[in-house]
């Protein structure tokens, strides 16, 4: 999906008002310095591409993020403010439902959500030069 046509300011508002809080809740009990940020993004469409991938694509050691509250709110925000997004994700969602077995918070998931927090922060500051 091409995120170029999304309403970025509305997605930013959704992140600041709800998604960020859900990410913090998920990460509660871990230190902010515990994980190094290894995933980065260069502009807002790129950030959303990476956020989408990390949030909804199962990875080795973490296959259970899609049903978390922050993930559901992310999906809704993308559907609401990215024209055509929801329909492109229907098949992916069905595949995800089949893949998901149980909701277990692993260290790998915590690391992945830490990466997500970094991507969202970068999305909110698009004019900052890449480090």
């Amino acid at each position: 999906y091409d995120f170029t046509n999304c309403d970025f300011e509305k997605i930013k508002a959704a992140y600041l008002s709800t998604i960020s809080k859900d990410l913090i809740t998920y990460m509660s009990g871990t230190k902010s310095t515990e994980f190094n940020n290894t995933v980065s993004c260069s502009n807002r469409p790129h950030c959303l591409t990476e956020i989408q991938s990390l949030t909804f694509n199962p990875t080795a050691g973490c296959a259970s993020l899609a049903k978390e509250m922050f993930a559901m709110k992310t999906k809704a925000a993308l559907a609401i403010w990215c024209p055509g997004y929801s329909e492109t994700q229907i098949n992916a969602t069905q595949a995800m439902k089949k893949a998901r077995k149980s909701k277990v918070t692993t260290n790998k998931c915590l690391e992945q959500v830490s990466q997500l927090q970094g991507l969202w922060r970068r999305f909110n500051r698009p004019l900052l030069k890449q480090q």
């Epitope: 559907a79 024209p83 055509g84 329909e87």
Partner: antibody, heavy 121, light 112 residues
Amino acid sequence: EVQLVESGGGLVQPGGSLRLSCAASGFTFSNYGMTWVRQAPGKGLEWVSSITFASSYIYYADSVKGRFTISRDNAKNSLSLQMNSLRAEDTAVYYCTRGGGAYYGGSLDVWGQGVLVTVSS
Amino acid sequence: DIVMTQTPLSLSVTPGEPASISCRSSQSLLHSYGYTYLHWYLQKPGQSPQLLIYLVSYRASGVPDRFSGSGSDTDFTLKISRVEAEDVGVYYCEQTLQTPYTFGGGTKVEIK
């Protein structure tokens, strides 16, 4: 400029057929769900039908189900509403609108000028 | 079907004064993903409707900030902080939580 222009309205006898068209311009038509809304003379707004951007999902009001067919041609940036077995209660101004999919929560953010359909003998 | 009920039916307002329109749904419009699928439209005399507010409180592009939306669950309000002559027309609420999408009956706003 984002624009929706309807055509095809007119006077038709009960039981007759009519095909409404909507030409879209100024935006990437294939990215958006589209919806038909109607308004009977002096009355409020009534949702008629919606179609998602790739035609995967189509919805109809019970009052038109089995009689009306919504379709779109993304290559031509056009939306259509085929209306069969028309009744007097279908008399209304029909609006072509952008939205009705998930985008903006299904709100209708662009409206055409409307086209009048009169069903009378 | 979700029934949308608007009050009042009509409203006569002095320019510069505030106005408030209520919309009530027969069931909650809160989606499980955390957004509420309630929108407001204005139909000015002789014109097509236009989107004012979507998802309860988000102003549509180009809508003046004197318009604001609020509410949750089944009770919603559209407020105009200072009514201007150009605000006359019929205001409609709409739910898009589930099909059939349904509109309120409308509230006619006139200037005194």
